[in-house]
């Protein structure tokens, strides 16, 4: 028997210091954890214990902080290849800087191979992009070889900026055919490394025959076998084991999200690559593992460029942007419109000709706006004035939803309202009416849309069957402040682009901002 | 060295059931496919199911559903076949081998069990 | 289920003879094709797995080849101890199915 092990991250996200126990920035540094200094730390004490080790991360590194924002991804590429990592997948923010933004700081920069089977690119931009990115990878491993074969969500063109000129094909059509020419090559231990989320994860270990081990991301899923060490509730077993249409049995891993654990996989495999047994669990990287000195140096000369970067101007307003609880817990304010406008504006994506765009909607919590922006400081806007409005570090994230299940969304927006609460919605591309008068639950008169599959966009009454995609923050696609029912009602939801960066790259492409009070949200009681 | 180990001959009346077991041993017992395949007088080999002793999962053909049962003994690494009302055409040598999932080949077979069914 | 079709059923030979020994699948089975030799009262011994690859100890001169749905095994000089009945086995789609053998006889 031949045992590998197989460490393992994804949706990293720009976490490159030590974040806090809910991966926003570290407060406290004795409470702190992961970041790529503690990350190696743990690595090599695995590697000098053990003798075939891989290290893989399963895409989405791009995007999350002030890191991607300055450093474009030759950040990803330059601690990556510090860490020695053996092989990466492309996930779907990879692509958010457009292609350009891929191929530049990382794929000509990466010293380990950047690996996806189903994204073929066509055009001009297939010899450019020839050989920068594999289908698959078969690596040395002590005395064997392991294949690596990688996959992209094919929902990449809805949830970042691939361009024209790749096409993401289905992950099991293009994968089987990927395999099959691993085997002919006589390699007969091969992990499928991508990033498609959990569900497709497991449906690659069921239909692909040959993968013997699927390592995946996108849906931040935590596996855990035992008790958990921290807050994440274990979606399952680590490792999960699907049984393959043939009978195989093929552990499926996992580790959560922003690089606060290392996937540990121990997988033994006969001479014949059949894996004969598989064990593991994440391991947390808190602060008892200390953050390697050489690396942590290297990451605070980085850090200087950050620093000077938040007191730059990003762009300028000419009217006060009100971001105060007063306005945006009780009505329409002209923060909550910006934000929604640069949401929207995130998420252009002409990728059908029958739609304007594939998403129109945007709600935010009021709640989730921590502060206004002063106009009358020369107008300037920087990221430290947009850290101060969006304080948490999250996302704006892509969701798929029932009509009524929006409708809910809305009545739980006012359904105690007058109470300065945060569930208080915040919108874009919606028309609400709420008559204060009646009991809650029912306080929503008017909830128009506007459409999608039109060249003159124009809007229409929610219909509550009908789908539709709405931009939000992922505070509230979790269930956060009360909205239980986007939760459990969702329908999909992919992660999306971190929310100071998403107004920052708003405000700078507008360089000159006048956000209004335009009437998005009206009360027919006539007393607001 | 890796093997496979059956018990005995059985003679059985028509109607009754028989069980038959397979004892491995020199490899990881819960790490494989074992799979049962028997042979009737002068016929070809006919695939009869398997068992995954590693979760006790079974696959069975139409043919045998609902008259065989597979299980596993992982403490004492052995495998065992039932097949019930029992029929004269039942008489064969049965075979326990253990499978292989890169190409699902059986690589390692029992010596066979001869189970005669007669009046 | 996937049938599997062996031919011939049975051919005579001589020592230091070629033998080739066809199996025909009811649908495309991607090369999971296994060969397996057996001799009276003995169990079936594995030859050739995936089309072509020799099982460990198997003597060269057995050779496997084929592809879809037709596949071959081949003796390239036939041994005194290769007289033995030959199966087939898909190995692609449950149920696993077997061909009915061809037995080599001396001539």
């Known amino acids: 028997a031949w045992e590998l092990t197989i460490l393992h991250t994804n949706d990293v996200h720009s976490r490159l210091e030590q974040t806090s126990e809910d991966s926003s920035k570290c407060v406290n540094a004795s409470r702190c954890m992961g970041g790529v200094a503690r990350l190696f730390t743990k690595v090599q004490q695995i590697r000098r214990a053990e003798p075939n080790v891989l290290l893989l991360d399963a895409g989405d590194q791009y995007q999350g902080t002030i890191w991607f924002t300055v450093y474009k991804g030759a950040e990803v590429a330059h601690f990556m290849n510090a860490l020695r990592y053996d092989a990466m997948a492309l996930g779907n923010h990879e692509f958010d800087n457009g292609v350009e933004g891929l191929i530049e700081p990382l794929l000509k920069e990466a010293k380990f191979p950047i690996l996806s089977a189903n994204i073929k690119a066509k055009g001009p931009l297939a010899s450019q992009i020839s050989g920068l990115y594999l289908p698959y990878k078969v690596l040395p491993v002590g005395d064997e070889v392991v294949g690596i074969v990688g996959y992209t969500s094919k929902e990449t063109p809805f949830l970042s900026n691939p361009g024209t000129n790749l096409v993401f094909e289905d992950e099991i059509t293009a994968l089987q055919p990927e395999v099959d020419k691993l085997k002919t090559l006589n390699v007969n231990k091969i992990i499928a490394l991508g990033h498609s989320g959990f569900e497709m994860d497991k449906l690659i270990a069921q239909k692909v025959r040959g993968v013997d081990v699927v390592v995946g991301g996108h849906s931040n899923t935590f596996l855990y076998t035992g008790n958990p060490p921290s807050k994440e509730v274990p979606a399952g077993k680590y490792p999960f084991i699907v049984t393959s249409d043939d009978g195989r049995k093929v552990p499926v891993v996992q580790a959560y999200a922003f690089g606060k654990y290392l996937g540990y996989l121990k997988i033994e495999f006969d001479e014949r690559g059949n894996v004969i047994s598989s064990h593991g669990n994440p391991i947390l990287l808190n602060s008892s593992i200390p953050e390697d000195p050489s690396i942590k140096a290297d990451i605070n000369k980085w850090r200087i460029k950050l620093d000077n970067y938040s007191t730059q101007e990003l762009g300028k307003t000419i009217v006060y942007l009100d971001g105060s609880s007063q306005s945006c817990r009780f009505r329409e304010c002209n923060m909550g419109n910006l934000i929604c406008d640069a949401m929207i504006n995130n998420n252009l994506r002409h990728t059908d000709e029958m739609f304007w765009n594939h998403v129109s909607m945007c709600i935010l919590n009021g709640g989730g706006i921590r502060s206004p922006i002063d106009e009358r400081n020369n107008g300037t806007i920087t990221w430290e004035n947009l850290a101060a409005v969006l304080p948490f570090g999250g996302t704006f994230d892509l969701v798929q939803l029932k009509g009524s299940t929006l409708k809910k969304a809305f009545e739980h927006s006012v359904h105690r309202y007058g109470q300065s609460t945060g569930e208080f919605l915040q919108v874009g591309g919606i028309h609400v009416v709420y008559d204060l008068s009646r009991k809650p639950g029912d306080r929503v008169v008017k909830l128009d849309v506007l459409c999608t599959k039109c060249r003159v966009p124009s809007y229409d009454p929610l219909k509550m069957d009908e789908v539709y995609k709405v931009i939000l923050p992922n505070f509230l696609a979790n269930g956060g402040d009360g909205f239980q029912m986007i939760k459990d009602e969702l329908l999909r939801h992919d992660s999306g682009d971190q929310d100071i960066n998403v107004v920052s790259t708003y405000i700078s492409k507008m360089k000159v901002i006048y956000p209004a009070v335009e009437g998005r949200i009206k009360f027919s009681t006539g007393s607001h | 060295q890796v093997q496979l180990v059956q018990s005995g001959a059985e003679v059985k009346k028509p109607g009754a059931s028989v069980k038959v077991s397979c004892k491995a041993s020199g490899y990881t017992f819960t790490g494989y496919w074992i799979q049962w395949v028997r042979q009737a007088p002068g016929q070809g080999l006919e695939w009869m199911g398997a068992i995954y002793p590693g979760d006790s999962d079974t696959r069975y053909t139409q043919k045998f559903q609902g008259r065989v049962t597979m299980t596993a003994d992982t403490s004492i690494s052995t495998a065992y076949m039932e097949l019930s009302r029992l029929r004269s055409d039942d008489t064969a040598v049965y075979y326990c081998a253990r499978g292989n999932w890169d190409d699902w080949d059986f690589d390692v077979w029992g010596q066979g069990t001869t189970v005669t069914v007669s009046s | 289920d996937i049938q599997m079709t062996q031919s011939p059923s049975s051919l005579s030979a001589s020592v230091g003879d070629r033998v080739t020994i066809t199996c025909r699948a009811s649908?495309?089975?991607?090369?999971?094709l296994n060969w397996y030799q057996q001799k009276p009262g003995k169990a079936p011994k594995l030859l050739i797995h995936y089309t072509s690859r020799l099982h460990s100890g198997v003597p060269s001169r057995f050779s496997g080849s084929g592809s879809g749905t037709d596949y071959t095994l081949t003796i390239s000089s036939l041994q005194p101890e290769d007289f033995a009945t030959y199966y087939c086995q898909q190995g692609d789609t449950l149920p696993w199915t077997f061909g009915q053998g061809t037995k080599v006889e001396i001539k």
């Open positions: 649908q495309d089975i991607s090369n999971y």
